[in-house]
Interface confidence: low
């Protein structure tokens, strides 16, 4: 399926609008500090060139690979050395090393100012004045802050963003219409970015075998009526799509994702009864819908797994014959029967089954050796079940904010070397599992909770990899993808940690505290809580609660005072002294 001109092929397949959007996303994810106008200029140049290739595929340079074309374009940026430092050295390399070099310089935590939302009227004016520029700006700002955002999905978000403004800028109460929609897009976008980051980490750090195993388990839960070969085909195609997107090949990725959606909709009968409503939608919405589709009902007459995977005398023969296919079938059979298990648990069970076969198939009596393999699964199943039960009980008892605080204390004690902003971000997100999952019925709690925690902990791993400070974090992040969460859960208080010296500056607050939003106030308090634990890692829950209650009272008192700044200046040192005494 080779084409004389790859760029012409993709331009024709995707159409001009999607082509331009995806090139803008690709460039913004690589050069995260470049100004918007610079990127727009580069995209326009690439688009004009693509059009010449569509007109004549034999034209000069049209036969070059997309990496070559895009890399050459990125390397024309005049300020590359000043803005990006050593990333400019990538331009001295040849493809494919140059693209690999750009990928390695993607920054998961770029030093960019937080996006400030202007007044609604200002946004609506900008939208009406130049809709195209307004939407490009959205793609650019999201892509540069989220360099692994799933590009075809970002086009879907942009379409929803556009629809929100088109509807709400005509409404009587623009703000009431628009702001909830923008909040929803922001929250969904952050979640989508984090989920995709885990997929890319899985592929890049653990290889496509790890990703394929994840995909077999997840798709088998979603499509339990599909044959194993059907699931395998979907897994192969999905792996290609995500490998491309994670590798910066966004045009190929979007094109292949569209092909996959087309295939699924043409073959609904052999995949799932739940695809119908997705397949009537336009492309971007259809692909999103298929990705989020609910699990189909399990076939009624599924036989016991024991016959083929435990009782059969041929287990070792079958395993030896084609290990990955046999294990893939085991994972498929187990996952389709267990929509109530997290994907990570299913992968742990498959790993345990594989380990048992590796050991037993070399034993004198293999069948006797692996006969009790399913009994060995019990503790693996009970561990996340108990964890979810305990944490949901704690969440229901404390509410989200205090539950986050409990996790902040727990994780700061485990890995106190990690930076305070990272601990706050990660623990706040870990704490959101309560509201997200604990309200669900029992059968949906574990898949919701543990697979969400895997996404959040991946963020910790990604940030920590950039600036490694803790051997424990490195160990949990790199040893096993499926055991990351149990590894972090098992960490205890770090006895080797030397407590941080007390710094009064960290606990000095000002009147600007009073004008912060509720969320920003929480972050300030939680930042102080982490610093307290770093200073006194052995402080009890009661001691910490006392200090935090005093802190809340002190802030409330000063924010009600006539001279707020004077109050903070006077009461602040008293609060610090009282806290030190309470924790002594």
């Amino acid at each position: 399926d080779t084409h004389k001109s790859e760029v012409a092929h993709r331009f024709k397949d995707l159409g001009e609008e999607h082509f331009k959007g995806l090139v803008l996303v690709a460039f913004s994810q690589y050069l995260q500090q470049c100004p918007f106008e610079e990127h727009v200029k580069l995209v326009n140049e690439v688009t004009e060139f693509a059009k010449t290739c569509v007109a004549d595929e034999s034209a000069e340079n049209c036969d070059k690979s997309l990496h070559t074309l895009f890399g050459d374009k990125l390397c024309t940026v005049a300020t590359l050395r000043e803005t990006y430092g050593e990333m400019a050295d990538c331009c001295a390399k040849q493809e494919p090393e140059r693209n690999e070099c750009f990928l390695q310089h993607k920054d998961d935590n770029p030093n960019l100012p937080p996006l400030v939302r202007p007044e609604v009227d200002v946004m609506c004016t900008a939208f009406h004045d130049n809709e195209a520029t307004f939407l490009k700006k959205y793609l650019y700002e999201v892509a540069r802050r989220h360099p692994y955002f799933y590009a075809p999905e970002l086009l879907f978000f942009a379409a929803r963003y556009k629809a929100a403004f088109a509807e709400c800028c005509q409404a009587a109460d623009k703000a009431a219409c628009l702001l909830p929609k923008l909040d929803e897009l922001r929250d969904e976008g952050k979640a989508s970015s984090a989920k995709q980051r885990l997929k890319c980490a899985s592929l890049q750090k653990f290889g496509d075998r790890a990703f394929k195993a994840w995909a077999v388990a997840r798709l088998s839960q979603k499509f339990p009526k599909a044959e194993f070969a059907e699931v395998s085909k979907l897994v192969t195609d999905l792996t290609k799509v995500h490998t491309e997107c994670c590798h910066g090949d966004l045009l190929e990725c979007a094109d292949d994702r569209a092909d996959l959606a087309k295939y699924m909709c043409e073959n609904q009968d052999s995949i799932s009864s739940k695809l119908k409503e997705c397949c009537d939608k336009p492309l971007l919405e259809k692909s999103h819908c298929l990705a989020e589709v609910e699990n189909d009902e399990m076939p009624a007459d599924l036989p016991s797994l024991a016959a083929d995977y435990v009782e059969s005398k041929d287990v070792c023969k079958n395993y030896a014959e084609a290990k990955d296919v046999f294990l893939g079938m085991f994972l498929y059979e187990y996952a389709r029967r267990h929509p109530d298990y997290s994907v990570m648990l299913l992968l742990r069970l498959a790993k345990a089954y594989e380990a048992t076969l590796e050991k037993c198939c070399a034993a004198a009596d293999p069948h006797e050796c692996y006969a009790k393999v399913f009994d060995e699964f019990q503790p693996l199943v009970e561990e996340p079940q108990n964890l979810v039960k305990q944490n949901c009980e704690l969440f229901e008892q404390l509410g989200e904010y205090k539950f986050q605080n409990a996790l902040l204390v727990r994780y700061t004690k485990k890995v106190p070397q990690v930076s305070t902003p990272t601990l706050v971000e990660v623990s706040r997100n870990l704490g959101k599992v309560g509201a997200k999952c604990c309200k669900l019925p029992e059968a949906k709690r574990m898949p919701c909770a543990e697979d969400y925690l895997s996404v959040v902990l991946n963020r910790l791993c990604v940030l920590h990899e950039k600036t490694p400070v803790s051997e424990k974090v490195t160990k949990c992040c790199t040893e096993s993808l499926v055991n990351r969460r149990p590894c972090f859960s098992a960490l205890e208080l770090d006895e080797a940690y030397v407590p941080k010296a007390f710094n009064a500056e960290t606990f000095t607050f000002h009147a600007d505290m009073c004008t912060l939003s509720e969320k920003e106030k929480q972050v300030k308090k939680q930042t102080a809580l982490v610093e307290l634990v770093k200073h006194k890692p052995k402080a009890t829950k009661e001691q910490l609660k006392g200090v935090m209650d005093n802190f809340a009272a002190f802030v409330e008192k000063c924010c009600k005072a006539d001279d707020k700044e004077a109050c903070f200046a006077e009461e602040g040192p008293k609060f610090v002294a009282a806290s030190q005494a309470a924790l002594a």
């Epitope: 070969a229 059907e230 085909k233 083929d308 014959e321 296919v325 046999f326």
Partner: nanobody, 115 residues
Framework: QVQLVESGGGLVQPGGSLRLSCAAS????????MSWVRQAPGKGPEWVSA????????RYAETVKGRFTISRDNLKKTLYLQMNSLKPEDTAVYYC????????GSQGTQVTVSS
């Protein structure tokens, strides 16, 4: 769409021969081991024979060893079962499966051995 379509069954006298074929489509046939399974009236499925993805390694149930031969043509995406010296107890619906699964994913082809 994954499809497995068996053919070649029929009525044959004891001691006779048949060659079953299974045409596969909708998946990467050459990447998977394949099996033949049979189900006699009123009985559960019984694994008959298996072949690895490349066709080099073949396995047989004791009941058919020496009489049946499994083979495949990856270019034609077809699996075969050559059945010689057929016995009345070989009467069953024969169907092909992916890997070593005994769960039916196809209609099968009826083989009847009777005088």
């Amino acid at each position: 769409q994954v499809q497995l379509v068996e053919s070649g069954g029929g009525l044959v006298q004891p001691g006779g021969s048949l060659r079953l074929s299974c045409a596969a489509s909708g998946f990467t046939f050459g990447s998977f081991g394949m099996s033949w399974v049979r189900q006699a009236p009123g009985k559960g499925p019984e694994w008959v024979s298996a072949i690895d993805s490349g066709g080099a390694d073949t396995r047989y149930a004791e009941t058919v060893k020496g009489r049946f031969t499994i083979s495949r043509d990856n270019l034609k995406k077809t699996l075969y079962l050559q059945m010689n010296s057929l016995k009345p107890e070989d009467t069953a619906v024969y169907y092909c499966t992916i890997g070593r699964s005994t769960s039916r994913g196809s209609q099968g082809t009826q083989v009847t051995v009777s005088s």
